[in-house]
């Protein structure tokens, strides 16, 4: 038994680093493979993460984690019984991957303005909670050309636009996604699209 | 009540081994990790060994090293010190301590807030 | 190892009046922010140390509120707001960050 592909890592900086990896022939994951991970820091022990099967050959583990912070290091040491495969270490301050942004709301009786307003995926006491920009997607069910991401760059989860931007008397869908420049992160997944229907008073035209 | 109470102290002769105990309770012992902390007579506190919950990792001061060893059976809640070729400057009042929370991933630090009567021990011959 | 230097080593003070002492580390104890492994402990005459602050800044269970702890990095300070009879003995600062653990020299409060 061998590991054809490394684990690699990310963490979402909160409480879960998910490691994935692929082995060289299929396995049952949750029975023969065990990952240990530790954190380097005094008196510290090392917890195990039963991995769960991903296709075939691959794997993936939960690690779960009480915090992060940006000193911390994990050593990695994947077992297959007695067998050690890999070892390894990781950074969760340096592949992190923010949790997905939730209860994504289009307001549409704000006059002719569309309100989204979403929520920021992690306690306040958290790190990124004040770090998170995010870009918005909305797009025509009827009309897959009618594509268009709105960056929002400051701190707070919301975004207005003008109804009469998009078409008036289709079905829109709306996600959002988040990352955080500090920690050069990449994208969170989409959170859970929301559908409205875009409707709005066309301006009264004066002959 | 969250109590740690010391016992093996004595007098011994240099070059011989004595043995201290610290029952804990109040509080999941297994959970926490332990600390031996000595004062000599007159002079500050000193930091000895600590051990994690489990008991797998273990650290020393380089002035104990290779002659005092750490351990713990956490089904009787008990930390023991086991002291081997015994020195004068060994001579002190022992504490055992409560130290940090270490089944968390990063162990949690509430300070040595929980600290023995002391025990203890004179070399001498 | 790291060393700690406390001052003063004496400090005489009224009752009433506030006290300060000053540790300063000879390496950074900040492991990562808000995480400063400093600690601060009262020893009164014959009896065991007792924690009065951890984590730099954080009252343990019981400690009056007199007591508070500050600083970050190498340079942390315990300040009495109102020093009583009772303060009075040994005050210690101690690392926790690396092995060993260090203490200060400690720092004797007596009543003026």
């Known amino acids: 038994m061998k590991v054809l592909q490394e684990p690699t890592c990310v963490s979402d900086y909160m409480s879960i680093s998910t490691c994935e990896w692929k082995m060289n022939g299929p396995t049952n994951c949750s029975t023969e493979l065990r990952l240990l991970y530790q954190l380097v820091f005094l008196l510290s022990e090392a917890h195990t993460c039963i991995p769960e099967n991903n296709g075939g050959a691959g794997c993936v583990c939960h690690l779960l984690m009480d915090d992060v912070v940006s000193a911390d290091n994990y050593t990695l040491d994947l077992w297959a019984g007695q067998q050690l495969l890999w070892k390894g270490s990781f950074k969760p301050s340096e592949h992190v991957k923010p949790r997905a942004p939730g209860n994504l709301t289009v307001h549409t009786n704000v006059s002719d303005t569309l309100l989204l307003t979403w929520s920021n995926p992690y306690p306040p006491d958290n790190y990124l909670y004040n770090h998170l920009t995010y870009a918005v997607n909305i797009w025509s069910e009827n009309d897959p050309a009618d594509f268009r991401i709105y960056n929002v760059t400051y701190l707070e989860p919301s975004l207005r636009i003008a109804a009469s931007t998009l078409k008036s008397g289709i079905s829109y869908r709306a996600r959002v996604r988040a990352w955080a420049q500090c920690y050069n992160t990449t994208w969170s997944e989409w959170s859970p699209s929301t559908k409205w229907h875009n409707s709005y008073r066309e301006p009264f035209e004066q002959h | 009540e969250v109590q740690l109470v010391e016992s093996g102290g004595g007098l011994e002769q240099p070059g011989g081994s004595l043995r201290l105990s610290c029952a804990g309770s109040?509080?999941?012992?297994?959970?926490?990790?332990m600390t031996w902390v000595r004062q000599a007579p007159g002079k500050g506190l000193e930091w000895v060994s600590s051990?994690?919950?489990?008991?797998?990792?273990?650290y020393y001061a380089d002035s104990v090293k290779g002659r005092f060893t750490i351990s713990r059976d956490n089904s009787k809640n008990t930390l023991y010190l086991q002291m081997n070729s015994l020195r004068a400057e060994d001579t002190a009042v022992y504490y055992c301590?409560?130290?940090?929370?270490?089944?968390?991933?990063?162990?949690?630090?509430?300070?040595?807030?929980?600290w023995g009567q002391g025990t203890t021990v004179t070399v001498s011959s | 190892d790291i060393v700690m230097t406390q001052s003063p080593l004496s400090l005489p003070v009224t009752p009433g009046e506030p006290a300060s002492i000053s540790c300063r580390s000879s390496?950074?104890?900040?492991?990562?922010?808000?995480?400063?492994?400093l600690d601060w402990y009262l020893q009164k005459s014959g009896q065991s140390p007792q924690l009065l602050i951890y984590?730099?800044?954080n009252r343990a269970s019981g400690v009056p509120d007199r007591f508070s702890g500050s600083g970050s990095g190498t340079d942390f300070t315990l300040k009495i707001s109102r020093v009583e009879a009772e303060d009075v003995g040994f005050y210690y600062c101690?690392?926790?960050?690396?092995?060993?653990?260090?203490f200060g020299q400690g720092t004797k409060l007596e009543i003026k």
């Open positions: 051990i994690s919950g489990s008991g797998t990792n273990t």
């Open positions: 984590l730099a800044s």
């Open positions: 109040g509080f999941t012992f297994r959970d926490y990790a």
């Open positions: 101690m690392q926790s960050l690396h092995t060993p653990y260090t």
């Open positions: 301590a409560k130290d940090r929370l270490s089944v968390s991933t990063r162990p949690k630090y509430y300070g040595l807030d929980v």
């Open positions: 390496q950074s104890l900040d492991y990562s922010y808000g995480y400063n492994y």
